[in-house]
Structure formats: structure tokens, C-alpha cells
Amino acid sequence: CRTSECCFQDPPYPDADSGSASGPRDLRCYRISSDRYECSWQYEGPTAGVSHFLRCCLSSGRCCYFAAGSATRLQFSDQAGVSVLYTVTLWVESWARNQTEKSPEVTLQLYNSVKYEPPLGDIKVSKLAGQLRMEWETPDNQVGAEVQFRHRTPSSPWKLGDCGPQDDDTESCLCPLEMNVAQEFQLRRRQLGSQGSSWSKWSSPVCVPPENPPQPQVRFSVEQLGQDGRRRLTLKEQPTQLELPEGCQGLAPGTEVTYRLQLHMLSCPCKAKATRTLHLGKMPYLSGAAYNVAVISSNQFGPGLNQTWHIPADTHTEPVALNISVGTNGTTMYWPARAQSMTYCIEWQPVGQDGGLATCSLTAPQDPDPAGMATYSWSRESGAMGQEKCYYITIFASAHPEKLTLWSTVLSTYHFGGNASAAGTPHHVSVKNHSLDSVSVDWAPSLLSTCPGVLKEYVVRCRDEDSKQVSEHPVQPTETQVTLSGLRAGVAYTVQVRADTAWLRGVWSQPQRFSIEVQVSD
């Protein structure tokens, strides 16, 4: 027999299967060109001195063989005597150590046995009921396939899985989804229903993130508020990178974890937009307002757990920057304007109350007045800051109020609402003898003293009822006692106290009469 032909004679060894565990297996035969075919197989066991024979039986019952020698792969043409158009049965017999070992048989039509392509192009990955669903377009003119997948994690070897039979223009596979580790998948295909058909090569890696994106482990710090009323948020610790399987290292589309920064400006609730989402790499400047900051990690399956921080408001106050004038029509605030066409947000809340009780008002964009000031006015009827209590006021400014990261703090200060001059009048004024010509005057602190920076000073007025002479004594806002000296015994005096702010003179307390008794010597 010629070596290129299938020999229709008895093979050169006795016909007896040893039944041993070793031997040929996994025979695959397929067409490799218009007129050529290839069969390949595995051999289990020691290979020294082994001769392989590819056996073939035609549908007529006639059988032949090809001698492959020690090779486990053999090619032949359509002129080799094997009927390629009709079904044939093929198997391998290996002659070794005076015994014959046989592979399982495969029955196929060689003409149609082509090696399939793996999934090509775009493999779409989605989540379905806690599993991974992969979908791809069936390679053209190769409909009808068995599909397998293999997958590994950064710490585990390949595991094999089955996708089942496919018979459509699109093919799909359900695979296990890991909760917390990335996976690499590869897919391969072979002809459906064709015994002994060859598997395609493995597809390119499909890199799949864990179902839960890793929780971001980051830390922030906030710089001091600058002259421009803004402070920078800085990232102290970068998020940890996801560990990837070998085939996904380098360029691993699909496993990317994106970290986004969600800012929620708690102050000034009357503005149009309270939240903004940014890329984590782009650290914003913030006003001195209070914020909640969340870092949200997400991958192609959606967002994961987020980490949230509270950034408290900057409470540094400007004692003199705000002027308030109270008239019959209402109240007007003045402060140094920031720039042309600025929108201002004026926020106020009673001191010592929950931050959630803040009230605010948004101005229309305004230009500075001739004195370079910005203003905000309100009527008594509006009820704004109408109660006689201490309010904390913050003014924010922005040229683009719709952009959350462009607000700046203009000033923060305290203001006593309502009729401050009357409400601030000191009560419980008392006079005690101090010496032969002096007295000590005490009073209860003014309500204005509860408002930092509002009470400028106390003024104590002493009137000599005989001569009608009046003397006034300024007292530091932190003091509630003064000594009046140079008084004359037997003279009637009245004393009054008032509390002044930077822009308002207070109302005198009720007159308190006293006199120093004349001392009679023995």
C-alpha cells in the first residue's frame, strides 16, 4: 500500500484489544482544505515504541488503515480511498509492547466536518438572576454548535463548563458570577451533532468584574477656607485596584471599576441643584457650607456600596463684613459684593437649633451698587429673622448657581433678629455700696450677649438728680458690672444700662434710684 492511501488490507499486527487503561483517546477528524483532511488524537501512557494506525470503515463494510508511526496526527487527501461524502467510522489502534490498544470510535461525514471559529468580535456580558449571561453573534455560516467555556480567578486555575447546544444566529451562555473577585472567561465552539468534531481555538479573554464592586477605601481632607471663600477637598488615599486574572492584566475592558464622587451641599437648600457627581480624579473646590460626600464604586453591573463622609460647615465668622439697617419698611443687609452678576444665597437659622431649620433666600443675579456693596432686603411682614433671638447668617455667592462646585462663602456672622434694641435691654440692674464715694452697679447679661460679635458694648448712665449732671460709662461686652466713683453722700442718683450693637443704640433700662448715706462720726 502507498503511504498516502488508506490500505485495504489487514493491519500488520494481531487484532486484539488489550483493554488497558492507557492507549489512544479523544480522536478528532476534520477537513482542513478543499481536498485535505486531518485526524489527531491523544495517547495516554508511555510513548516509547508505540505505533499508531488510523482505522476507517466505509458504509459498504470495507475497512482500511493509515500507518501514522509514532505521530498522533495524520493528514490525507480526498483521493486516499476514504469516502469523504458519506459517513465513515474511524478509530485509532496503537500497537505497543505486543498489545493493541483501541480508541473509542467516531462516525462522521468528513466532507462536512469543519473546525469552527470561536466566538468572534463583541461578546456582550450581562447579569441574569445572579448569573452571568454572555451573548455573541454566531460566526457566519456556522450555525449549530456545542459551546464550552473555561474560567479562572486571580487565585484559581481554569475550570471547564458547558453552555449547551446552540442553534441560532446568536449564541449565549450562562456562567457563574463571582461576588467579590474578577474572572477571566474564554469560549470555544464545535459542530453540533457531529461525533469527533474538533473544538475551535479558545476565544479572546472576556474579563468580568465581581458582582459587587470593591468598596472604596479612601480618606479626604479639607483645606482651610481661602480668601476667595473656597476650600479644596483633597484625596488622602487612592482606592485599591482590583486584582485581575492573568489574561486580564494590562488591558482588561469589562473589569473597570469607576469611582465617582457625589457631593451634596446641605447648606442653602433653596438653590436649584443640591447634588453633583464628579469623577474621583477631579477633586473639587467647595464653599464653607456643610456637605455630605459619598464615593460610589461601580462596574458594568451597576453601583456597589458607597462610603459617606460629612464635611462640617466652616464656622469662622466675619464680625464686621455685614451691615444691617432696620427701617420702618423692613430690613436691609449690605456686604462687600463679589463680582458682577452674582447670585447670592442668604441663609439664616436660630442659634442652638438643628441645622435642618435653616431658612434661605436666593437673590436674582446682581451687580455691585456704587459703593461696591451687594444688598438683600426684606419686609417685616415676611417674618424673616423676625423673632427676637440670635441668628447665624451665612452668605454664599455664585456666578453659576446651577453648578454646585462654583459656590463660595462670602461671610458668616451672627445677627439678633426682631426689635434688638428693646430685646437687648439689660434687666435686673442692682446697685450696691462700694465705698464712701462709690457704688457697684450689676446687671443681668443682655440677650444680645448670646449672639457672638453682636453686642458692641454696654453703656451705664448715672444722673445726679440735684444738679441734673449726667455721666456715661462704656463697659466691655463681656462685663456685667461697673464701679461708679466720685459720688457724693446724701445726693440722689438714678442709674440706667443699655446694650449697643455696631449699628443700633440700645434702649435704656428702667431708672434705678440710689443714694450714699451720710456717715455720722461718733
Epitope: 477537513r31 478543499s34 466532507y111 460566526p139 457566519d140 455560516n141
Partner: nanobody, 127 residues
Framework: EVQLVESGGGLVQTGGSLRLSCAAS????????MGWFRQTPGKEREFVGE??????????ADSVKGRFTISRVNAKNTITMYLQMNSLKSEDTAVYYC??????????????????WGQGTLVTVSS
């Protein structure tokens, strides 16, 4: 469904050449192979050749081997198959049909293995 339309037939001298085209449209990705058959009056359709679409592997009847060549061009949802006929003989005169099959188990020479057929184009070889 798949639609097949042949073109390129005509009159040619003995020894001359002609190229036939078959345009397939519709669900062409489901096709496994396309083939050419021919028929003369009063006779059965005769297998000429076939091409396995995904690989470009060809197979010819002995009567045309060496003279005829089949090729194909794949595009999205359209396939054009060609039959290049050289050294034409008078016995090549026939109506040429293109056909398409969707199953991997068929034998190329059998007409009943093909689910889709064109309407045919006439080739006349005159001496």
C-alpha cells in the same frame, strides 16, 4: 428565509469563458454551503460544485474539475457566489441553478439536501 438570484448567463463560443453570479440575501448567516447545479431538457439536475461558506472549501463534479472554479464573497447578510467557467464545451450548455443548504449533514451531490434554489440562468455554448 434566504433568497437566491443568478445572473451572468448567455451565449459563448466553445473554448470561451463565462462567469456566473449568485446573490444570496436574507438569513444568509444560517447557510452552511452553496452549490451550483445544471439541467438540460428532459434530464435531472446535475451537481456541478459546492463551496463550504465559512471556510471557502470547494468540491467539484469530475466533469468540470480543472475547468470550473467556485468562489464567494461574504458581506453582512449577503453572500455572492461565483462560478468561473473556462474552456467551455458544448456539453456545458444548460440552465445553471444556484442552491443553498443549512444543514451540516448533507451530501453536496444530492439536490434534496438544499433548501433554497434560484430561478436559473441559461448558458449556451455554441461551436
Amino acid at each position: 428565509e434566504v433568497q437566491l438570484v443568478e445572473s451572468g448567463g448567455g451565449l459563448v463560443q466553445t473554448g470561451g469563458s463565462l462567469r456566473l453570479s449568485c446573490a444570496a440575501s436574507g438569513r444568509t448567516p444560517r447557510l452552511v454551503a452553496m452549490g451550483w447545479f445544471r439541467q438540460t431538457p428532459g434530464k435531472e439536475r446535475e451537481f456541478v460544485g459546492e463551496i463550504i461558506l465559512s471556510k471557502g472549501f470547494t468540491y467539484y463534479a469530475d466533469s468540470v474539475k480543472g475547468r470550473f472554479t467556485i468562489s464567494r464573497v461574504n458581506a453582512k447578510n449577503t453572500i455572492t457566489m461565483y462560478l468561473q467557467m473556462n474552456s467551455l464545451k458544448s456539453e456545458d450548455t444548460a440552465v445553471y441553478y444556484c442552491a443553498g443548504r443549512q444543514n451540516w449533514s448533507g451530501s453536496p451531490a444530492r439536490t434534496n439536501e438544499y433548501e433554497y434554489w434560484g430561478q436559473g440562468t441559461l448558458v449556451t455554448v455554441s461551436s
